[in-house]
């Protein structure tokens, strides 16, 4: 099979193919104006249009604008990718009452359970808090939910759980209009009893649940709201999210309210010098020396080859599992045969520094 022979001439004479020395394989040449979705395309569907930044290629092959999460009540759930839109959701402490494609048209604050009711299900980005009547065993002095303990599993609720209705608690479901802090503050004062993290059913230590609006007096569970592209670090400071704007980096996780953006080396590259939430230096994937492969003859590939039938015999040059750990049967400095195909197959985490040993084989840098 031509694809299994490392000979360049097998691809020549066909204008729709080219030879990639790095993977020792014939590749499909994407037509003008189309870009490969993997290092060595194998067919026309491995090519795609390239859209402008902040646009994605939809199912009809059109470049479509990614939605923006710039409204105060929204946060980015997933970033804008080449083939999918950015997805926004209501920020912590709020839920979506009117959904929109890849976003939410209207977010409301989670309701507080009224006196005599306790949280059955805490509010999420999609659903409001669900309350249920406190059990008969609970003290009638339990006037506000934050003082009430959840009933033990042995108690039977008196009625079916019900979400707090906006009709009965209009103040508690006040929508947040883009950027009006007064509305947020008003909503905050109306809907939150002092020190009431349990009103949404979680302990106050959970940072994902603290309200994002300014604190009412006496409330200890609020957090600062940072500027766009900043996050609240563990010390409670607004810290700039790292930027992945360098050509050799791609965004791995977006900038969130409580965590930085993280960057990784783009497919086909590996991190040589790590940095906090990023990589200071990306280098092209090291290619395994041909002599380190168990069966070099009749091979066009760099990844593991198996000889039939005994499975499990590992060649010298072998990718580690996807979590980057070496198999138990091998030594920690086992050489890695790196496959430079799609980013999902990288055998070494791209944030892990790699050093080349004296044999020319890459080894994980423990430092």
């Amino acid at each position: 099979f031509p694809q299994d022979r490392p000979f360049e001439d097998t691809c020549h004479g066909n204008p729709s193919h080219y030879y990639d020395k790095a993977v020792r394989r014939c590749c499909y040449r994407c037509p003008m104006g189309l870009f490969p979705t993997q290092q060595c395309p194998q067919r026309p569907t491995d090519c795609r249009k390239q859209c402008e930044p902040d646009y994605y290629l939809d199912e009809a092959d059109r470049c479509t604008a990614c939605v923006t999460c710039s409204r105060d009540d929204l946060v980015e759930k997933t970033p804008c990718a080449w083939n999918s839109s950015r997805v926004c959701e209501c920020r912590p402490g709020m839920f979506c009452s009117t959904s929109a494609v890849n976003s939410c048209a209207r977010c409301f604050f989670h309701s507080v359970c009224p006196a005599g009711m306790i949280v059955k299900f805490p509010g999420t980005a999609q659903k409001n808090t669900v309350c249920e009547p406190a059990s008969p065993g609970v003290s009638p002095a339990c006037a506000s939910p934050e003082n009430c303990k959840e009933p033990s599993s042995g108690t039977i609720p008196q009625a079916k759980p019900t979400p707090v209705s906006p009709a009965t608690s209009s103040a508690s479901t006040m929508p947040v209009r883009g950027g009006t802090r007064l509305a947020q503050e008003a909503a905050s004062k109306l809907t939150r009893a002092p020190d009431s993290p349990s009103s949404v059913g979680r302990p106050s230590s959970d940072p994902g649940l603290s309200p994002t609006q300014p604190c009412p007096e006496g409330s200890g569970d609020c957090r600062k709201q940072c500027e766009p592209d900043y996050y609240l670090d563990e010390a409670g400071r607004c810290t700039a999210c790292v930027s992945c704007s360098r050509d050799d980096l791609v965004e791995k996780t977006p900038c969130a309210w409580n965590s930085s953006r993280t960057c990784e080396c783009r497919p086909g590259m590996i991190c040589a010098t790590s940095a906090t939430n990023s990589c200071a230096r990306c280098v092209p994937y090291p290619i395994c020396a041909a002599e380190t492969v168990t069966k070099p003859q009749d091979m066009a590939e760099k990844d593991t080859t198996f000889e039939a039938p005994p499975l499990g015999t590992q060649p010298d040059c072998n990718p580690t599992p996807e979590n980057g750990e070496a198999p138990a049967s091998t030594s920690p400095t086992q050489s890695l045969l790196v496959d430079s195909q799609a980013s999902k197959t990288l055998p070494i985490p791209t944030s892990a520094p790699v050093a080349l040993s004296s044999t020319g084989k890459p080894v994980l840098d423990a430092g």
């Epitope: 694809q3 026309p44 195909q341």
Partner: antibody, heavy 116, light 107 residues
Framework: QVQLQQWGAGLLKPSETLSLTCAVY????????WSWIRQPPGKGLEWIGE???????KYTPSLKSRVTISVDTSKHQFSLKLSSVTAADTAVYYC??????????WGRGTLVTVSS | EIVLTQSPATLSLSPGERATLSCRAS??????LAWYQQKPGQAPRLLIY???NRATGIPARLSGSGSGTDFTLTISSLEPEDFAVYYC?????????FGQGTKVEIK
């Protein structure tokens, strides 16, 4: 020499799940697409679906609700599961590799018979 | 999905004769078409890819032509080993589809 070896149950009862596995020996696994194709007795070929080394799948619409293709890259294997089989699923099932040269490498085929 | 229609269904010829097999697509597939040969009890074998390129080891008497919707596989002079079923296959649009086949039999 690169080879595809496939195996799985050959006789099934209606409503059972067909399960086949294909192993790649002597060649690369990543960077290619791995398909399942079937051929009812005396009839033509039907592409069922594919997977790549990173687990990305595509299925033919007529079977999409019943078919699952999975991959085990560490073993260089990929598998087909087809649920709720009927007599119409009786066929020779082939695994195949797709490259720039289309389906350039095929397994020998496994006859799966669905009969009560 | 793209439907590939092969004609004729059966072609009865003698060794040494010329065989012309047709494959028509319901919509354009550009040149993203392959031809396969299948003998009884065997898996299909790739003959032609990208409409007109012979696969490795395929003799020069087999040739492919066409683009868009009309494709032809030609066997210039039939050898005994050429009597088999031939399928065309497209990979221009999901799902990949095959023609129903043309059987080339000895007259």
């Amino acid at each position: 020499q690169v080879q595809l070896q496939q195996w799985g149950a050959g006789l099934l009862k209606p409503s059972e799940t067909l399960s086949l596995t294909c192993a790649v020996y002597g060649g690369s696994f990543s960077g290619y697409y791995w398909s399942w194709i079937r051929q009812p007795p005396g009839k033509g070929l039907e592409w069922i679906g594919e997977i790549n080394h990173s687990g990305s799948t595509k299925y033919t619409p007529s079977l999409k609700s019943r078919v699952t293709i999975s991959v085990d890259t560490s073993k260089h294997q990929f598998s087909l599961k087809l649920s709720s089989v009927t007599a119409a699923d009786t066929a020779v099932y082939y695994c195949a590799r797709e490259t720039v040269y289309y389906f350039d490498l095929w397994g020998r085929g496994t006859l799966v018979t669905v009969s009560s | 999905e793209i439907v590939l229609t092969q004609s004729p269904a059966t072609l009865s010829l003698s060794p040494g004769e010329r065989a012309t097999l047709s494959c028509r697509a319901s919509q354009s597939v550009s040149s993203n078409l392959a031809w396969y040969q299948q003998k009884p009890g065997q898996a299909p074998r790739l003959l032609i890819y990208d409409a007109s390129n012979r696969a490795t080891g395929i003799p020069a008497r087999l040739s492919g032509s066409g683009s868009g919707t009309d494709f032809t596989l030609t066997i210039s002079s039939l050898e005994p080993e050429d009597f088999a079923v031939y399928y065309c296959q497209q990979r221009s649009n999901w799902p990949w589809t095959f023609g129903q086949g043309t059987k080339v039999e000895i007259k």
